[in-house]
């Protein structure tokens, strides 16, 4: 028996075709995914192949205006209108607190939600009973197949659940789940999930009676032969993983942000054992029709964001200097404003030993686009920041060792002077730089904000400790010659959207006045 | 090499049965949809229906429909069109053509060379 | 069914000659639209497809445009061995649907 197991994962709110970047679409003639060409590939292959599901790792919130706007109605509606079999929640599901989860997607989605190892406690128990499940038995032509959902543990500490959710091991979460479905007749097992690409791989290795597993978070691209577009594969499509018991269990996960579609075959014996694997990501290029009715949907929808860009998040009543003579050169405010929104983004206090988990930001200077000038009212647009922040990145969260950090800032001023991007601005650190030293020893002061701590203040940087840091998804990809953070990087979770990051801090303050304290001196 | 060879010219009466083939190689058969083309003499070119061999699903053309089949056998990786009764009408020069649903090229990579079918009492 | 309007049905044109063939869908098809061209006693051949993505060993003369229900195959300097007959067909919906056929002859 032959199943066909379409994927997505990571899309992040690329409702529209995008870049070959996945930035936002600038030459139609080139651009990729989006929701319209992905319901045409679908369309395709439902109408060639008898026993075909449509799955989703997570991750379909937060990434651009589309959420921002619409905050996951967008969505619940597209998805539906794709008839998705079913989607694995994501971290960024819970963004919007469980309440912006419940609403636009719980309620409204006609496809099960799930995650086995999301366990919900006290008054929340009752009012989401029932809306996301553990597992879902799904009829397939005339099979069975149960997919069982996982979300990263890590989820409290990379977006907003609340307190009434606690996330269990994923391992030990779904081996019950797991043998339920067995107990249920249940032959053939999907574990769909957002946990990275390790987690899935540890999955497929340990959770006995799992045949496929099919994965997010870590925005992984695997291909079988020579890839398409600019990824580079991390290993085959499917990954094989040899299970505890013997088996051979094919991984997979489609990238991210809508840009290929996941595309996996499986042979299955009358017991259920996976006789054969393969398959391969296709690129949803400008080559593949957007599907015209999907398409004219999108363009209703967007109306509204076209309105809402213009309109006011809230006030500067000082000039927000994002000069490439001020950001790449010194202190700017507009790289305290950015960093602080950063670090804002980020508050979760969840250990009393702790009054955050993490305090510090490194941001680069040629990032920093667009200064925005205050005597227009002061009035702060989404606009207005689409041009500080034009690249549609995030903003992430890694965990370096001090070391790291010291060779990254020794990089920020290696070549000083020359208006390069590489120059960093800063949250939670104060930097001293004496320039009259050689290129990689032109730190003399380095200290950082504790977290460990009921009264934050700034200690040395310690080279062995390791530390969190909010940071541009581009410089936790080595871009600007950080190649230091990308090799040595100990862990990595993608964040928000940078506008939706600065956005919500201005509206959230209402006025703003960021200045230049001091962050970054020079001897 | 990717080759689509069609089987040889046919000539029948009318009320005659008939089934061409067309067999695929140098490529995964059952990964590509077949179509089958019709070109009446001196006339342009009619999509007759399709077949995805994988799954055996069949999609026609409603002018076709009921007037011919298409079938497959994916062990010999060949296509087959087939004539229950033919008319003078159906005389034709017909071509199988591929069709790749797991690209991106919106069309027929590869025909065969046609099969010419003259019906005439 | 989509009809595909294909114009002119016959063309004269000299070998360097820019020769452009229109076809027009009775609805939005989405630029899934394909063009072939047909030798007399041969099989048609795949130039381009999805309106502007010329097909693998076609030479860059050949060229494709076009968006919701306008499409046009473009030969930018006719050579000996174009003269033949050109097919649009749209891939969008079936019945898939061809046009008339542009027979380019000799002048």
């Known amino acids: 028996w032959e199943l066909t197991i379409l994927h997505t994962n990571d899309v992040h709110s690329r409702l529209e075709q995008t870049s070959e970047d996945s930035s936002k679409c600038v030459n139609a003639s080139r651009c990729m995914g989006g929701v319209a060409r992905l319901f045409t590939k679908v369309q395709q292959i439902r109408r060639a192949e008898p026993n075909v599901l449509l799955l989703d790792a997570g991750d379909q919130y937060q990434g651009t205006i589309w959420f921002t706007v619409y905050k996951g109605a967008e969505v619940a509606h597209f998805m539906n209108a794709l008839r998705y079999d079913a989607m694995a929640l994501g971290n960024h599901e819970f963004d919007n607190g469980v309440e912006g989860l419940i609403e636009p997607l719980l309620k409204e989605a006609k496809f099960p939600i799930l995650s086995a190892n999301i366990k919900a406690k006290g008054p929340l128990a009752s009012q989401i009973s029932g809306l996301y499940l553990p597992y879902k038995v799904l009829p397939v032509g005339d099979e069975v197949v149960g997919i069982v959902g996982y979300t990263s543990k890590e989820t409290p500490f990379l977006s907003n659940p609340g307190t009434n959710l606690v996330f269990e091991d994923e391992i030990t979460a779904l081996q019950p789940e797991v043998d339920k479905l067995k107990t249920l007749n249940v032959n053939k097992i999907i574990a769909l999930g957002h946990s990275g690409f390790e987690m899935d791989k540890l999955i497929a290795q340990k959770v006995r009676g799992v045949d496929v597993v099919v994965g997010g978070h870590s925005n992984t691209f695997l291909y079988t032969g020579n890839p398409p577009s600019k990824e580079v594969p991390a290993g085959k499509y499917p990954f094989i993983v040899t299970s505890d018991d013997g088996r051979k269990v094919p991984v997979v996960q489609a990238y991210a942000f809508g840009k290929y579609l996941g595309y996996l075959k499986i042979e299955f014996d009358e017991r259920g054992n996976v006789i054969s694997s393969h398959g391969n990501p296709i690129l949803l290029n400008s080559s593949i029709p957007e599907d015209p009715s999907i398409k004219a949907d999108i363009n209703k929808w967007r109306i509204k964001l076209d309105n809402y860009s213009t309109q006011e998040l809230g006030k500067t009543i000082v000039y927000l200097d994002g000069s490439s003579q001020s950001c790449r050169f010194r202190e700017c405010n507009m790289g305290n404003l950015i960093c602080d929104a950063m670090i804002n983004n980020n508050l979760r206090h969840t250990d009393e030993m702790f009054w955050n988990h993490v305090s510090m930001c490194i941001l680069n200077g040629g990032g920093i686009r667009s200064p925005i000038d205050e005597r227009n009212n002061g009035t702060i647009t989404w606009e207005n920041l689409a041009a500080v922040l034009p690249f549609g990145g995030t903003f992430d969260l890694v965990q370096l060792k001090g070391s790291t950090l010291k060779k990254a800032f020794e990089h920020s001023v290696h070549r000083y002077g020359q208006s390069t991007g590489e120059f960093l601005q800063v949250g939670g650190i104060h930097v001293v730089y004496d320039l009259s030293r050689k290129p990689g020893d032109r730190v003399v002061k380095l200290d950082v904000l504790c977290t460990k701590c009921r009264v934050p203040s700034y200690d040395p940087l310690k080279m062995d400790e390791v530390y969190k840091v909010i940071l541009p998804n581009f410089l936790a990809n080595g871009g600007d010659g950080f190649q230091m953070i990308k090799d040595e990087l100990l862990r990595h979770d993608s964040g928000d959207q940078d506008i939706n990051v600065v956005s919500t801090y201005i509206s959230k303050m209402k006025v703003i006045y960021p200045a230049v304290e001091g962050r970054i001196k020079f001897s | 090499e990717v080759q689509l060879v069609q089987s040889g010219a046919e000539v029948k009466k009318p009320g005659e049965s008939l089934k061409i083939s067309c067999k695929g190689s140098?490529?995964?058969?059952?990964?590509?949809?077949l179509s089958w083309v019709r070109q009446m003499p001196g006339k342009g070119l009619e999509w007759m229906g399709e077949?995805?061999?994988?799954?055996?699903?069949?999609y026609y053309n409603e002018k076709f429909k009921g007037q011919v089949t298409i079938s497959a056998d994916k062990s010999i990786s060949t296509a087959y069109l087939q004539w229950s009764s033919l008319k003078a009408s159906d005389t034709a020069m017909y071509y199988c053509a591929r069709y790749d649903y797991l690209g991106s090229s919106y069309g027929f990579d590869y025909w065969g060379a046609g099969t010419t079918v003259t019906v005439s009492s | 069914d989509i009809q595909m309007t294909q114009s002119p049905s016959s063309l004269s044109a000299s070998v360097g000659d820019r020769v452009t063939i229109t076809c027009k869908a009775s609805?939005?098809?989405?630029?899934?639209v394909a063009w072939y061209q047909q030798k007399p006693g041969k099989a048609p051949k795949l130039l381009l497809y999805s309106a502007s993505y010329r097909y693998s060993g076609v030479p860059s003369r050949f060229s494709g445009s076009g968006s919701g229900t306008d499409y046009t195959l473009t030969i930018s300097s006719l050579q000996p061995e174009d003269f033949a007959t050109y097919y649009c067909?749209?891939?969008?919906?079936?019945?898939?649907?061809f046009g008339g056929g542009t027979k380019l002859e000799i002048k």
């Open positions: 077949i995805y061999p994988g799954s055996g699903n069949t």
């Open positions: 140098g490529y995964t058969f059952t990964s590509y949809g």
């Open positions: 067909q749209q891939h969008y919906n079936t019945p898939y649907t």
């Open positions: 609805q939005d098809v989405s630029t899934a």
